[in-house]
């Protein structure tokens, strides 16, 4: 359940995350599985552990193998396994299947190609993008943050796309490349004004003080792939990131495509250790696309704990 394949090229940086994730405050120890030898945390080592991350700076073919990470969580030490394979660089242009990340599909309306695994690295824009080993040039191609946008997608745009970026670690630079296939689907989609499925307008959500609470903002935007669509939460009209309450975080849910073909998005608002003052806030679920913005407001109310396993009924 908690084993993950990771791969990279020799002489490039490779950063692997422990498949068994814990809270940021938890200690994570890394070991070579075969020898049970601890991986050092000192950054002067070529291979070192840094919390949930295992860093190969740079990687060598001999680094291939299974690595064990142990998350020192309360009650149990939880174990994960990272199966790492480092390959020799290919002399020709072909990228073998075993180096490919998951295929993504695009259409005329949505042609984003995300650079795989980039979130694990300390990189700075811009990314370099290649298609079938050729550097991409022309106004149709736009490198934006961690993805590539192709304007006016055509079937000829299908192919293997490689992103290349530099990882910086304590002033030293390491190259990283990642490749994935892009397919073009001819799709008769449409976009409409956002429809919020949950929460209901002016919904009252019952919560227990001291417990955790989740609010889901779910909206649909039309049929097929959407070029611009977003759902988010605001607190008293302020973005979650700007509100400055670490107990309250939003987390992207799964992209949903229902049997009727509607394209929908979820955003979960997680409130840890609900406090009295949280009941005074206004929670706004916002859904927006090119057509406009729709807002549904939720308020929290205290749930009177009628606990079936209370010792005093």
């Amino acid at each position: 359940k908690f084993s993950k394949q990771s791969w990279g090229l020799e002489n490039e940086a490779l950063i692997v995350r422990c498949p068994r994730q814990g809270k940021p405050s938890y200690t994570v120890d890394w070991y070579y599985s075969q020898t049970n030898k601890s991986i050092p945390t000192q950054e002067r080592n070529r291979v070192f552990a840094s919390g949930q991350l295992l860093k190969f700076l740079p990687a060598e073919v001999a680094d291939s193998g299974i690595y064990t990470c142990i998350v020192r969580s309360p009650t149990f030490n939880r174990t994960g396994y990272a199966n790492v394979t480092i390959y020799k660089k290919q002399s020709d242009c072909n990228v073998p299947d075993y180096l490919m990340y998951s295929t993504v599909s695009g259409s005329e309306k949505n042609s984003k190609i995300y650079c795989p695994t980039i979130d694990l690295y300390n990189w700075t824009a811009p990314l370099e993008w290649f298609k079938n080993c050729q550097a991409l040039q022309g106004s149709r191609y736009r490198a934006h943050k961690s993805f590539l946008v192709i304007d006016n997608v055509m079937t000829e745009d299908a192919g293997d796309y490689t992103c290349k970026f530099i990882h910086n670690e304590n002033g030293a630079n390491y190259s990283v490349t990642a490749t994935r296939s892009f397919t073009v689907k001819d799709e008769q989609g449409f976009s409409l004004f956002p429809v919020i499925g949950a929460p209901a307008q002016n919904e009252i959500k019952e919560v227990e003080i001291g417990k955790n609470a989740n609010l889901t903002c779910s909206a649909c935007f039309g049929k097929g792939t959407q070029f611009l669509a977003a759902v988010l939460w605001q607190l008293n009209g302020t973005k979650i990131t700007d509100f400055g309450e670490p107990r309250i975080q939003q987390e992207e849910g799964q992209n949903q495509s229902f049997s009727n073909g509607l394209a929908c998005l979820d955003m979960v608002l997680r409130i840890a250790d609900v406090k009295e003052e949280d009941l005074l806030l206004q929670y706004d679920c916002l859904a927006l696309n090119l057509h406009g913005l729709r807002r549904h407001t939720v308020r929290l109310s205290r749930k009177n704990p009628i606990d079936h396993h209370s010792i005093y009924c």
Partner: antibody, heavy 122, light 111 residues
Framework: EVQLVESGGGLVQPGGSLRLSCAAS????????MHWVRQTTGKGLEWVSA???????YYPGSVKGRFTISREDAKNSLYLQMNSLRAGDTAVYYC????????????????WGQGTTVTVSS | DIVMTQSPLSLPVTPGEPASISCRSS???????????LDWYLQKPGQSPQLLIY???NRASGVPDRFSGSGSGTDFTLNISRVEAEDVGVYYC????????FGGGTKVEIK
């Protein structure tokens, strides 16, 4: 209603085997760590085994190699296979819910079953 | 293994009076996340154990506010501000830092 119901206890001879079951309802069973805790007559509580959401298992030295905990998330069920039973294993066995192993939230061992009695005697 | 030691073994109480139970662990129960993994449970006669306090000082849902938990490191206390007749039973402390270990129990009975 959040509930745990144990079954499978009974009388067994020393060296024999027994399989306990625990049926969970009213919560998302698959995300929780689950425990077996036992209590010998007139004595205190002793932790017997645990299983986390990944299926990793944990045991104290007193039962390691003899007891096996397992879970079937599709059936919301927890099991304890007890082999090579000894007189000292005679106890009431409780199934109990631990922390949320997905979000790493811990609110104590907050749900307990009613217990099932295991008697090891010739 | 972490060893939990409870005292007293038996505690005769008078309804309306306060009572306290002590629990000591063989090592600190403070985790890197900042919480003390120490719980208190009450087992009433003929019943399953029931959670009173978790993470050292958090009252479980439905538990009266006359129950409170305190302490840090290796020393913890369960306080009952005014004992009621229904509070009789055996109280256990339990550490959940490294698997689970229970204290030996404190039997609370009415004088």
């Amino acid at each position: 209603e959040v509930q745990l119901v144990e079954s499978g206890g009974g009388l067994v001879q020393p060296g024999g085997s027994l399989r306990l079951s625990c049926a969970a309802s009213g919560f998302t069973f698959s995300t929780y760590d689950m425990h077996w805790v036992r209590q010998t007559t007139g004595k205190g509580l002793e932790w017997v085994s645990a299983i986390d959401l990944a299926g990793d298992t944990y045991y104290p030295g007193s039962v390691k190699g003899r007891f096996t905990i397992s879970r079937e998330d599709a059936k919301n069920s927890l099991y304890l296979q007890m082999n090579s039973l000894r007189a000292g294993d005679t106890a009431v066995y409780y199934c109990a819910r631990g922390g949320d192993g997905y979000n790493y939230d811990y609110y104590g061992i907050d749900v307990w079953g009613q217990g099932t009695t295991v008697t090891v005697s010739s | 293994d972490i060893v939990m030691t409870q005292s007293p073994l038996s505690l005769p109480v008078t309804p309306g009076e306060p009572a306290s139970i002590s629990c000591r662990s063989s090592q600190s129960l403070l985790h890197s996340d900042g919480y003390h993994y120490l719980d208190w449970y009450l087992q009433k006669p003929g019943q399953s154990p029931q959670l009173l306090i978790y993470l050292g000082s958090n009252r479980a849902s439905g538990v009266p506010d006359r129950f409170s938990g305190s302490g840090s490191g290796t020393d913890f206390t369960l306080n009952i501000s005014r004992v009621e007749a229904e509070d009789v039973g055996v109280y256990y402390c339990m550490q959940a830092l490294q698997t689970l270990t229970f204290g030996g129990g404190t039997k609370v009975e009415i004088k």
